[in-house]
């Protein structure tokens, strides 16, 4: 079956700036400014478009070992980014795949809104954990913050 | 406009086929999912069955699971509902229906077709 | 699967009077997932609104939506004329997508 979720949290950089670091450049940035979340990201094919199949590896110690993600969209222009998660993680018995769509939207303060929408494909009657949801957004958040601190502290980068 | 017209209703009898069109026109077509939603007589609306934007995930009602198959060809702007099996029960208008939401969709319902009917009967 | 349950099942009316047609939901609809549709006879369903209290486009104002838990609420302000017919619920946080059975909005 499926799922619908969705989830929102402000920051204080703005859209344009977010986007570039936590999205565009996020395979190189995420490893450096939380190493201790995510270890690599690798594209295993594709360019960084659509279709576009990347690795991402945790730490040892990590309840998962990797995911893959298959990048469905990236809209520059409304600071938008789909991607589903195919392989590893929580994907297996229960998850067939996750469909997430991160969207950043200017805040009328100067900095922005990441919206995040998830959908769920369970396999067979299995129920989405809530628990599970919250963990998967208390992650993404901390990812978000670590992004931010680094922007914070180099006010020159992703300009 | 978005514009949404079925086709392929008409009598049939139990235990055969029907395959029923939904041409679509007037948005991004291969950018949104694709639902169809049905309605027996003098009665409610029930939710058929699910296709999404590019045609790798096909979800359905309990009542027409194994029966119904939910295709599309988005070269085309066209989906399909291949009915099986059919019983007196399917009897109902057949709606097609835009996703409210690009992409991978919200599953709510923004346009929806003038629908077709189907009648099972012997 | 939720369920939903609406009440009344027929709400009579006069143009002008304000409408308030409830939707009850068997569990928790997380992020507001609630849509509220319009049909009138020989007709299409029309949304009118989505995520329990936006208007779709091209709504007039007199519709709106809100929430309280599991209960949620279509208002019509002002009836007009146009405004009679039938109206569903409908879910969209977990499949299978469900509606309610509708409430007739009937002229008195």
């Known amino acids: 079956g499926v799922f619908n979720y969705e989830a929102e949290t402000p920051s204080v950089i703005p859209a344009a700036r977010l986007f570039k670091a936590f999205i565009l450049d996020g395979d190189k940035l995420l490893p450096k400014v939380a190493p201790e979340a995510v270890s690599s990201v690798e594209n295993i094919e594709g360019n960084g478009g659509p279709g576009t199949i990347k690795k991402i590896t945790f730490p040892e110690g990590s309840p998962f070992k990797y995911v893959k993600e298959r990048v469905d969209e990236v809209d520059r222009v409304n600071f938008k980014y789909s991607f589903s998660v195919i392989e590893g993680g929580a994907v297996g018995d229960a998850l067939e795949k996750v469909c997430n769509e991160i969207k950043i939207v200017a805040a009328p303060d100067g900095g922005s809104i990441l919206k995040i929408s998830n959908k769920f494909h369970t396999k067979g009657d299995h129920e989405i954990n809530a628990e599970q949801i919250k963990i998967e957004k208390e992650k993404a958040v901390g990812l978000l913050k670590a992004v931010e601190s680094y922007l914070l502290a180099h006010s020159d980068a992703y300009n | 406009q978005v514009q949404l017209v079925e086709s392929g209703g008409g009598v049939v009898q139990p235990g055969r086929s029907l395959r029923l069109s939904c041409a679509a026109s007037?948005?991004?077509?291969?950018?949104?999912?694709i639902h169809w939603v049905r309605q027996a007589p003098g009665k409610g609306l029930e939710w058929v069955a699910v296709?999404?934007?590019?045609?790798?995930?096909?979800y359905y009602g309990d009542s027409v699971k194994g029966r119904f198959t939910i295709s599309r060809d988005n070269s085309k702007t066209m989906v399909y509902l291949h009915m099986n099996s059919l019983r007196t029960e399917d009897t109902a208008v057949y709606y097609c229906?835009?996703?409210?939401?690009?992409?991978?969709?919200?599953?709510?319902?923004?346009?929806w077709g003038q629908g077709t009917l189907v009648t099972v009967s012997s | 699967e939720i369920v939903l349950t609406q009440s009344p099942g027929t709400l009579p009316l006069s143009p002008g009077e304000r409408a308030t047609l409830s939707c009850r939901a068997s569990?928790?609809?997380?992020?507001?997932?609630l849509a509220w549709y319009q049909q009138k006879p020989d007709q299409a369903p029309r949304l009118l609104i989505y995520?329990?209290?936006s208007r779709a486009t091209g709504i007039p104002d007199r519709f709106s939506g809100s929430e309280s838990g599991t209960d949620f609420t279509l208002t019509i302000s002002r009836l007009e004329p146009e405004d009679f017919a039938v109206y569903y619920c409908?879910?969209?946080?977990?499949?299978?997508?469900?509606f309610g059975q509708g409430t007739k909005v009937e002229i008195k």
């Open positions: 229906a835009k996703d409210g939401y690009s992409l991978y969709g919200k599953d709510y319902f923004d346009y």
């Open positions: 007037g948005f991004t077509f291969s950018r949104y999912a």
């Open positions: 296709i999404s934007y590019d045609g790798d995930d096909k």
């Open positions: 569990q928790s609809i997380t992020n507001s997932y």
């Open positions: 995520g329990a209290s």
């Open positions: 409908q879910q969209y946080v977990r499949s299978p997508w469900t």
